[in-house]
C-alpha cells in the first residue's frame, strides 16, 4: 500500500533570465527511492539515481544543474519555461510517486513564491 | 525504429584483444544506461558491464574485471567493449542492451549480438 | 553458478497455465525488481517483464509476473507452441553492484 506523500515547492513564478529551485520531498514511507525523474510536460529534464548519480538530458545541459539535494535548479529562465513540471519518485516498494510544480517566468520584476502543497 | 547493431566480433587468439560496437538508433542515447550481456554456445545469459548516460559510472560482472573496459561515445551514438587478455572462455555471443529509463527495471532493447571465439 | 536460482526445465500442453519460479537473496530480489526475458532458438533475449510485474506494450497478458520475498515467478497462461523458448529472470544485486541472471528456464509444449 502506498502511504507516502510528496510535498513540493507549489505554484512559483520567477523572473526572466533568473533562475529557480524545483524541489519535492517524499515523507509518510519507509519506501527506499531508487530514482527521481524530473520532466517537464512529456519532456526528460534530468534523474538521480541511487546508484549512478545524475543525468541531465542533452537539450537541458546548460540551463539545468542538479540539487540541491533530489531537487532541480532551472537557470537563466525564458517565458517559454512556464509550466508544468513533475518530480517522479521511483520507490521499492511503494511504487510511483509523482509530485507537481507550476512555474510561471514573468518578465517584470514581481515574482514571488506561491504556497506549499500536498499531493498525496 | 529504436534498433542497437553490434559489431567488431570474430576470431582471436588467446591473450588477444577485441574491440566491440553497438550503434544506437531512434532514440535519444545520451538518456540511457547501457549494458553489454553475453551467451556461451548453449549456455545461458552473463551479465557482462553497465555504463551510466556520460560514462563516468561503470561496473563489471567479476568474470571480466581488470580485463574489459566499456565506453561510450555520445556524440556518435556508440557504446563500445574493449576486450583484453581473451580467454577460450570468453568465446560467446555478444549483445547490447538498452535499459529501462529506471535502469533497475530491466534490459527493454536487445540488439542481435556479435560472436566472439577466442581459439588458437 | 548463477545468482539466481531457476529450474533448468519446465513444461506444459497447449492452454495450460505454466509457472517459473526464480530465487535469490535479500541483496537482489527482495528488496529490488526482476525482470523476465524470452530467448527464441537463434535470437535475441525480449523482455516480457519489468518492474517486477509490468508488461511492455506488444507483449500479451498471459504473461505475468509476481514477487514474494527472495522469489520471483513467470505465469503463462493459455499456453501456445511458440511460447516455447528459454526463459531468464534478472535483478540488480545491491550488495554486488550487478546485475545478475538466472540460469534460464527451457519450457517445452508438450
Known amino acids: 500500500m502506498m502511504t507516502g506523500t510528496i510535498e513540493t515547492t507549489g505554484n512559483i513564478s520567477a523572473e526572466k533570465g533568473g533562475s529557480i529551485i524545483l524541489q519535492c520531498h517524499l515523507s509518510s514511507t519507509t519506501a527506499q527511492v531508487t530514482q527521481v525523474n524530473w520532466e517537464q510536460q512529456d519532456q526528460l529534464l534530468a534523474i538521480c539515481n541511487a546508484d549512478l548519480g545524475w543525468h541531465i538530458s542533452p537539450s537541458f545541459k546548460d540551463r539545468v544543474a542538479p540539487g540541491p539535494g533530489l531537487g532541480l535548479t532551472l537557470q537563466s529562465l525564458t517565458v517559454n519555461d512556464t509550466g508544468e513540471y513533475f518530480c517522479i519518485y521511483h520507490t521499492y516498494p511503494d511504487g510511483t510517486y509523482t509530485g507537481r510544480i507550476f512555474l510561471e517566468v514573468l518578465e517584470s520584476s514581481v515574482a514571488e513564491h506561491g504556497a506549499r502543497f500536498q499531493i498525496p | 525504429e529504436v534498433q542497437l547493431l553490434e559489431s567488431g566480433g570474430g576470431l582471436v587468439q588467446p591473450g588477444g584483444s577485441l574491440r566491440l560496437s553497438c550503434a544506437a538508433s531512434?532514440?535519444?542515447?545520451?538518456?540511457?544506461?547501457m549494458s553489454w550481456v553475453r551467451q556461451a554456445p548453449g549456455k545461458g545469459l552473463e551479465w557482462v558491464s553497465l555504463i551510466n548516460w556520460n560514462g563516468d559510472k561503470t561496473y563489471y560482472a567479476d568474470s571480466v574485471k581488470g580485463r574489459f573496459t566499456i565506453s561510450r561515445d555520445n556524440s556518435k551514438n556508440t557504446l563500445y567493449l574493449q576486450m583484453n587478455s581473451l580467454r577460450a572462455e570468453d568465446t560467446a555471443v555478444y549483445y547490447c542492451a538498452r535499459h529501462w529509463i529506471v535502469f533497475q527495471y530491466g534490459l527493454d532493447i536487445w540488439g542481435q549480438g556479435t560472436t566472439v571465439t577466442v581459439s588458437s | 553458478q548463477s545468482v539466481l536460482t531457476q529450474p533448468l526445465s519446465a513444461s506444459g500442453t497447449p492452454g495450460q497455465r505454466v509457472t517459473i519460479s526464480c530465487s535469490g537473496v535479500?541483496?537482489?530480489?527482495?528488496?529490488?525488481?526482476v525482470s523476465w526475458y524470452q530467448q527464441l532458438p537463434g535470437t535475441a533475449p525480449k523482455l516480457l517483464i519489468y518492474n517486477s510485474h509490468q508488461r511492455p506494450s506488444g507483449v500479451p497478458d498471459r504473461f505475468s509476473g509476481s514477487k514474494s520475498g527472495t522469489s520471483a515467478s513467470l505465469a503463462i497462461s493459455g499456453l501456445q507452441s511458440e511460447d516455447e523458448a528459454d526463459y531468464y529472470c534478472t535483478s540488480w544485486d545491491d550488495r554486488l553492484k550487478s546485475w545478475v541472471f538466472g540460469g534460464g528456464t527451457k519450457l517445452t509444449v508438450l
Open positions: 531512434g532514440f535519444t542515447f545520451d538518456d540511457y544506461v
Open positions: 535479500s541483496s537482489n530480489i527482495e528488496i529490488k525488481y
